[in-house]
Interface confidence: medium
């Protein structure tokens, strides 16, 4: 333990300037003090000052108040340091002396005389509050205050607890009045050596070396280290655990860099044409009338839509067309007739009906013929009645739809499920695609229908075609072919045109 007993002398009154022996001081009592501090004694006895002793310089003559903090070489308050556990009790002897000699070192002067003395015995707890007291005898009065405080770095009721504040690698704390540690802001732990990470920093995926920091462990990122890092090179995919690459909708391949929905992502078809996906970066554009080209970017001849009626001939102009009408017709599209029923204008057995008091006519056409003069044979495919890419064919008075694989019905509107007959062996997952079923095989099997059992290094036999890269180890006994542009399939064996379901796991 370590502490200091402090004594503040405030006022001494000796109005008659008398000594303890009844004599008076000439010209006045030049007063200094001797203080002796020792262990508690019920009856104060002479002997060593076991807790310490101190003397002052001359502080005044007869009566005076002590206001200076330094009086010559002395100090006020007077300091009595100790290097032991404060016992809580003490005995104190304060003696006032007169000296005829030196002001600063009166102890050394001969002829010093006692003026008065007081003895205090009692208990005193450690604390900052001063205990104020005064003692009188017949001739003098002394006002004083005293307290016990701990030395720097010592704490507790008896100044026995050592605590030195620090802010370094070994701890970040201050000391409480009882000597316990009080962590500085941002630190925790028994010795305040563990930083408190940024609020919300993921407990497992993040850590910190100083407060309000969040350093991510491998595979994690973000301010709070709660976002996984996907596989390096993952283009259009996400992860739920590090190094994963789960493809976004419409993307496929090991790195989710193969576009399965080129139509939506790139809108390559122009002029209102319809876009159909057909595999990675594969698509077809179905043009509206009047347009052609791979992307329907080319406008056809303005006459391509046969705008001239009643046998009129069409001539292209810079931004439009011009109809040359046959005799008896006029108008922009030769739609107006100067003929009447008398001119027998209806062909193919059409019946003529007069209109507007005989100034014009209308033809009622027999089946399979159309046009204002029944001059055109009906094409039943002009309304595009076949769905899902079916081809329309005129068959005499009717038409039929020739359906693409996987579709049926009068208008190819019904989808045939190739997976209904469970073509995938060994628990393979079946995917219905336009050109037939495709199997995704479980670990240890490969082949179009998962019929081949793998018993060796899956890539050793070079299963990937067309320059594709083979990967193993992604899951036991599996290999993955990363196809070059223009090829798809579990082994990259198919040129673009067969839409796959990715990833291809053989």
């Amino acid at each position: 333990g370590s502490g200091i007993f402090q004594l503040r002398l405030q006022e001494f009154v000796n109005q008659r300037g008398m000594l303890a022996n009844g004599q008076s001081c000439e010209p006045g009592c030049r007063t200094f003090f001797r203080i002796c501090l020792k262990h508690f004694q019920a009856t104060f006895s002479e002997g060593p000052c076991t807790f310490g002793n101190v003397s002052t310089p001359v502080l005044g003559t007869n009566s005076f108040v002590v206001r200076d903090k330094n009086s010559g070489s002395g100090r006020n308050p007077l300091q009595l340091p100790f290097n032991f556990t404060w016992p809580g009790t003490f005995s104190l002897n304060i003696q006032a002396w007169h000296t005829p000699g030196d002001d600063l070192r009166p102890e050394t002067s001969p002829g010093n005389s006692l003026i008065s003395q007081i003895i205090i015995q009692g208990s005193l707890a450690v604390g900052k509050i001063w205990r104020t007291d005064e003692q009188n005898d017949t001739l003098t009065r002394l006002s004083y205050s005293y307290r016990v405080i701990c030395s720097d770095n010592y704490y507790g009721e008896s100044c026995s607890r050592l605590c030195k504040k620090r802010d370094d690698h070994f701890g970040h704390y201050e000391c409480q009045p009882d000597g316990s540690l009080s962590c500085l802001p941002g630190w925790t732990g028994k010795y305040c050596d563990q930083p408190i990470c940024l609020s919300g920093c993921h407990e497992q995926n993040g850590y910190c070396s100083k407060p309000d920091e969040c350093i991510c462990r491998p595979g994690w990122q973000g301010r709070l280290c709660n976002e996984c890092i996907p596989h390096n090179g993952c283009r259009h995919g996400t992860c739920s655990i590090p190094w994963q690459c789960a493809c976004d909708e419409g993307w496929g391949g090991l790195f989710c860099d193969q576009d399965l929905n080129y139509c939506t992502h790139h809108s390559p078809c122009k002029n209102g044409s319809t876009c159909s996906n057909s595999g990675p970066k594969g698509y077809t554009c179905t043009c509206l009338p009047g347009y052609t080209g791979e992307h329907c970017e080319l406008g056809l001849s303005k006459c391509a839509s046969n705008p001239c009626r009643n046998g009129g001939s069409c001539k292209d102009q810079e931004n439009s067309y011009h109809c040359l009408c046959p005799p008896g017709y006029y108008g922009q599209h030769c739609e107006h007739s100067t003929l009447t029923c008398a001119d027998s204008p209806c062909f193919n057995g059409g019946s003529c009906r007069e209109r507007n008091q005989g100034s014009s006519y209308a033809c009622e056409c027999p089946p399979n013929f159309t046009g204002s003069n029944c001059e055109k044979k009906v094409d039943r495919c002009t309304s595009n009645p076949c769905a899902n890419g079916g081809q329309c064919q005129n068959r005499g008075p009717s038409r039929t739809c020739r359906c693409r694989p996987g579709f049926t019905g009068t208008h190819c509107e019904l989808h045939i499920s190739d997976c209904a007959r469970s073509p995938c062996a060994h628990g393979g997952t079946c995917h219905d695609l336009e050109n037939g079923p495709v199997c995704t095989c479980p670990a240890g099997f490969s082949g179009r229908r998962c019929e081949v059992r793998i018993t060796h290094d899956a890539c050793a036999s070079g299963p990937c075609f067309n320059g594709a890269t083979c990967y193993t180890g992604l899951s036991p006994n599996n290999f993955v072919c990363n196809c070059p542009y223009g090829f798809v399939g579990s082994r990259c064996e198919f040129p673009v045109g067969l839409p796959p379901s990715f990833p291809w796991v053989a």
Partner: antibody, heavy 121, light 106 residues
Framework: EVQLQESGPGLVKPSETLSLTCTVS??????????WGWIRQPPGKGLEWIGD???????YYNPSLKSRVTISVDTSKNQFSLKLSSVTAADTAVYYC?????????????WGQGTLVTVSS | SYELTQPPSVSVSPGQTASITCSGQ??????ASWYQQKPGQSPVLVIY???KRPSGIPERFSGSNSGDTATLTISGTQPMDEADYYC?????????FGYGTKVTVL
């Protein structure tokens, strides 16, 4: 909360004695922890310490005023008083009473609101 | 008799630091106190025992005392700090005040 209140005449004739009383409330004037002092401030000038008293009756005065000043205490009324004799126009000032810490360096922590005393015939 | 000398005035911009000095022979051997006084009001103790602040006094007020000079520092000065400031010390049994410094916040 300790409060101090000065009272006394605001006008004193030259050569007469100025008398002021300070009443202490909210605390005992008999505390051994405090002295009770008087300070004055002439109009537009600085503060001047006049003197103080301990509850036991010990007094301390400004040497420049010592011959004219008397400070006394009445512990039964919780009051202390100032008398300044032979006043002149130079004694015109606001007079404050204050509580001074007896312990070293404590300063005057509570003051009255002050009372203006004018010396004039 | 003992004298304490202060500059008559100090000017400071808001938010800046104002320093007021108080000089006296071996002033560092004595305890210095500082008082703030606004027009028409009683003085208020702002620093005692050289550097201690009474409760209720803002932390921007601080003090020091060594050698022959005590200093009152007001850091981050605010318009409300515009006032007269007096230092005070004890010469044996006698209280002594400085002449006062007028602090103006520009």
């Amino acid at each position: 909360e300790v409060q101090l209140q000065e009272s006394g005449p605001g006008l004193v004739k030259p050569s007469e004695t100025l008398s002021l009383t300070c009443t202490v409330s909210g605390g005992s004037i008999s505390s051994s922890s405090y002295y009770w002092g008087w300070i004055r401030q002439p109009p537009g000038k600085g503060l001047e310490w006049i003197g103080d008293i301990y509850y036991t009756g010990s007094t301390y005065y400004n040497p420049s005023l010592k011959s004219r000043v008397t400070i006394s205490v009445d512990t039964s009324k919780n009051q202390f008083s100032l008398k300044l004799s032979s006043v002149t126009a130079a004694d015109t000032a606001v007079y404050y009473c204050a509580r001074e810490e007896a312990i070293l360096g404590g300063g005057s922590d509570y003051w009255g609101q002050g009372t203006l005393v004018t010396v004039s015939s | 008799s003992y004298e304490l000398t202060q500059p008559p005035s100090v000017s400071v911009s808001p938010g800046q630091t104002a320093s007021i000095t108080c000089s006296g022979q071996r002033l560092g051997d004595k305890y210095a106190s500082w008082y703030q006084q606004k027009p028409g009001q009683s003085p208020v103790l702002v620093i005692y025992e050289d550097s201690k602040r009474p409760s209720g006094i803002p932390e921007r007020f601080s003090g020091s005392n060594s050698g022959d000079t005590a200093t009152l520092t007001i850091s981050g000065t605010q318009p409300m700090d515009e006032a007269d400031y007096y230092c005070q010390a004890w010469d044996r049994d006698t209280g002594v005040f400085g002449y006062g410094t007028k602090v103006t916040v520009l």
